[in-house]
């Protein structure tokens, strides 16, 4: 069997949601000694980086300027040291968003609620898609999907403090090209005293995943690379 | 807003060399990444060089060794040095850069590309 390296790892910079026309940055972290790194987009080529020197750097940056839904879709990575190839790495999906129109949300019965009562989230968008996302802040990973003409429906069933937080919805023109967000609707959930004061609150701030871990090695930084080789076995 | 303007496409024997340039307009030539692609009659637009912000190079592997990119920052112009020119080499070539671009990214695919030329045309026959 041909021999191949470990397949790297492929990240967002901050996120994966890239409203149109700003830059999406994506990592692709491989191995010390790379001498080149591609950029695959929906199984073609797009972008080579050749880093300088490569025994000094585990990865690379892409950048993708002014992002449309030409740019949109399902990116992978490859990296060669001398003559061998990694695998490929695993995909990722690149959105776009702020596309065309601005979707409402709402919930019912109401944004103040108590633990174990139903609620239903509704996204309404009055312009031409029939897929609805909803997503939670600081969880853009998990995003719920539903469908309808103009509105869709998201029932959460019975709902305890993990459901507190912020949420937005967008209205989908494909898997890739998503509307602007819509206006965000803060979920009160409240239980009894000790489960209140005890649920923790999600993080408002981007997904920890979403960032770009690469390292430049200097003469001193032998003891980084070890523990990065260790890392990345572990992962693997 | 870029504007890019190709010149030096023209008739050429087989064999023979030719090269193209591609004038830019605007400061941000020297944080540009630049391209090469090319058009031939009923076929689809493709790759055939590309060039980063530091020089770094590559080629579509039928270009390879015969074509060179080149660019001179000082004169915004990106040039296509080619030769050995064969009969498939026949096409509409045009120019596109990536605008702004960071790091030393070398871009491939037609859709990283957001200003492009208007062509020159290039004929290889007898």
């Known amino acids: 069997p041909k021999q191949t390296l470990p397949k790297p790892i492929i990240r967002a910079e901050s996120t994966y949601m890239v409203p149109k026309e700003k830059q999406a940055t994506l990592c692709c972290q491989g191995s010390y000694g790379a001498v080149e790194y591609q950029l695959h987009f929906e199984g073609s080529l797009f972008a080579v980086e050749r880093p300088k020197p490569p025994e000094r750097i585990n990865g690379v940056k892409f950048h993708i300027p002014d992002m449309n839904s030409r740019k949109a879709g399902r990116y992978s990575c490859i990296y060669r040291v001398g003559e061998l190839w990694s695998e490929r790495s695993d995909l990722l999906d690149l959105v776009v968003t702020e596309m065309y129109d601005t979707p409402t949300l709402s919930v019912h019965p109401g944004p103040e609620v108590t633990s174990g009562e139903k609620v239903t989230f509704y996204c309404r968008l009055d312009t031409a898609t029939s897929m609805f996302l909803l997503l939670k802040e600081g969880r853009s990973r998990d995003v719920q999907r539903s469908y309808g003409k103009v509105q869709a429906e998201f029932p959460m069933g019975p709902v305890t403090t993990a459901h507190r937080g912020s949420y937005r919805c967008f209205g989908s023109y494909n898997n890739y090209a998503w509307s602007f967000p819509s206006e965000p609707v803060k979920l009160l959930v409240t239980g009894d005293i000790e489960n209140t004061s005890l649920a923790p609150t999600d993080p408002t701030f981007p997904d920890s995943w979403d960032t770009c871990l690469l390292t430049r090695e200097t003469g001193l930084q032998k003891d980084l690379a070890l523990w990065d080789h260790t890392a990345q076995n572990l992962l693997r | 807003e870029v504007q890019l303007v190709e010149s030096g496409g023209g008739e050429v024997q087989p064999g023979g060399s030719l090269r193209l340039s591609c004038a830019a307009s605007?400061?941000?030539?020297?944080?540009?990444?630049m391209g090469w692609f090319r058009q031939a009659p009923g076929k689809e637009r493709e790759f055939v060089a590309a060039?980063?912000?530091?020089?770094?190079?590559y080629y579509a592997e039928s270009v390879k060794g015969r074509f060179t990119i080149s660019r001179d920052n000082a004169k915004n112009t990106l040039y296509l040095q080619m030769s050995s020119l064969r009969a498939e080499d026949t096409a509409v070539y045009y120019c596109?850069?990536?605008?702004?671009?960071?790091?030393?990214?070398?871009?491939?695919?037609?859709?990283?590309?957001?200003?492009w030329g208007q062509g020159t045309l290039v004929t290889v026959k007898p």
């Open positions: 596109a850069a990536v605008v702004p671009t960071y790091g030393n990214n070398i871009y491939v695919h037609s859709a990283a590309y957001n200003y």
């Open positions: 605007g400061r941000t030539f020297a944080s540009a990444a």
């Open positions: 060039i980063s912000r530091s020089d770094d190079t």
